[in-house]
């Protein structure tokens, strides 16, 4: 089932999915002064079986000055909203995607396609969230969100990420250097803190990723 | 079980300094940002300091920014505030809280008077 | 002066349901911040009531919940109980400050 709204945004923050699971969808999306070949697919479905899935169909864009039609953007399936990630920055690189089994990899670029991918969430799809160069994390450990379906309807949970600015340096003449060690928020280590569900992720690429005390959900 | 516990409050003359500690025990702490917050007799709360979770960086409040330092020693899971030039108008009970903050200590008195 | 709005007193019967708003700005709520309210009991400290907007921590009764839109923010007590009666207060992060911003405080009386 498709998730009905966007994962949700956090300021001075991006969100990418290490690995998109069976049925999301990936719209065809050409940049400007491009549009997608006559009969060529509106969208990407990733699918599969109990041991590997891939993405089907493909993407392909071609000049706009070929035919006499000007249309660039792909239109979307009715009762379906956009679904938008932007490329978050190294070193958030996953550790290899294919060992999630039901999930599909980040797809490989098609030639001339549009800056920014706009995918079609399904229940049960988790995106991570780092702050923005020039910003960093008041709490440490993985900021997710995932899609989940509660009482019929889709939601996606809440990550907590706080991302703060331009750091205050010392106020003060020898004041002690600050440890260099991770921030976050309290996770409990007998009992989880209030937002402390989702906090353990079984990746390494989770475990460097910067987060807030918020960033977990109550059971 | 999340605990917090302060201490280092009590009664200082005007221009004099104290130093809180906050002792934390029961999660993570140091994953995890912390702050001061204080409430005067009778009034709201007001967020003094943040810390993030490896002391890297911390804001301050405009009212108490140039005279209170925040830290943390996170070998020792404890917070601390250095309040120095203390004021009447500092007067208050300091709590220490960890995250949104979602847990908070139950308090220090700090009482600035001559 | 606080920088989140709240009404500095609120009132109901038991049984009642009664709404407390919560102010803000583009710096903070309106930024996208998400709100927290926090309810205090007489010579306690602050409890975390409501996370996220609309989250409650366990053990909070679903007779407390809290909403979002724009630059404002409500937390709606259903069924109120005469151990409702405390201060509550919204609290959200704030950009320009660099820190969680509060409300006021209002004060909830159970008549």
């Known amino acids: 089932e498709l998730c009905d709204d966007d994962p949700p945004e956090i300021p001075h923050a991006t969100f990418k999915a290490m690995a998109y699971k069976e049925g999301t969808m990936l719209n065809c999306e050409c940049k400007r002064g491009f549009r997608r070949i006559k009969s060529g697919s509106l969208y990407m479905l990733c699918t599969g079986n109990s041991s590997h899935s891939s993405w089907d169909n493909q993407c392909q864009c071609t000049s706009s000055a070929t035919r006499n039609t000007t249309k660039q953007v792909t239109p979307q399936p009715e009762e379906q909203k956009e679904r938008k990630t932007t490329e978050m920055q190294s070193p958030m690189q996953p550790v290899d995607q294919a060992s999630l089994p039901g999930h599909c990899r980040e797809p490989p670029p098609w030639e001339n396609e549009a800056t920014e991918r706009i995918y079609h969430f399904v229940v049960g799809q988790m995106v991570y969230y780092q702050c923005v160069q020039g910003y960093r994390a008041l709490h440490r450990g993985p900021a997710e969100s995932v899609c989940k379906m509660t009482h019929g309807k889709t939601r996606w949970t809440q990550p907590q990420l706080i991302c703060t600015g331009e750091m205050e340096t010392s106020q003060f003449p020898g004041e002690e250097k600050p440890q260099a060690s991770p921030e976050g928020r309290p996770e409990s280590e007998t009992s989880c803190l209030v937002t402390t569900t989702d906090f353990q992720i079984q990746t390494e690429m989770a475990a460097t990723m910067e987060t807030s005390i918020f960033t977990t959900e109550y059971q | 079980e999340v605990q917090l516990l302060e201490s280092g409050g009590g009664l200082v003359q005007p221009g004099g300094s104290l130093r809180l500690s906050c002792a934390a025990s029961?999660?993570?702490?140091?994953?995890?940002?912390m702050h001061w917050v204080r409430q005067a007799p009778g009034k709201g709360l007001e967020w003094v300091s943040v810390?993030?979770?490896?002391?890297?960086?911390?804001y301050y409040a405009d009212s108490v920014k140039g005279r209170f330092t925040i830290s943390r020693d996170n070998s020792k899971n404890t917070l601390y505030l250095q309040m120095n030039s203390l004021r009447a108008e500092d007067t208050a009970v300091y709590y220490c809280?960890?995250?949104?903050?979602?847990?908070w200590g139950q308090g220090t008195l700090v009482t600035v008077s001559s | 002066q606080s920088v989140l709005t709240q009404p500095p007193s609120a009132s109901g019967t038991p049984g009642q349901r009664v709404t407390i708003s919560c102010t803000g700005s583009?710096?903070?709520?309106?930024?996208?911040?998400?709100v927290h309210w926090y309810q205090q009991l007489p010579g306690t400290a602050p409890k975390l009531l409501i996370y996220?907007?609309?989250e409650r921590p366990e053990g909070v009764p679903d007779r407390f919940s809290g909403s979002k839109s724009g630059t404002s923010a409500s937390l709606a007590i259903s069924g109120l109980r005469s151990e409702d009666e405390a201060d509550y207060y919204c609290a959200a992060w704030d950009d320009s400050l660099n820190g969680p911003v509060f409300g006021g405080g209002t004060k909830l009386t159970v008549l």
């Open positions: 809280a960890a995250g949104v903050p979602d847990y």
């Open positions: 583009s710096s903070n709520i309106g930024a996208g911040y998400d």
């Open positions: 996220s907007n609309n």
């Open positions: 810390i993030s979770y490896d002391g890297s960086y911390k």
């Open positions: 029961g999660f993570t702490f140091s994953s995890y940002g």
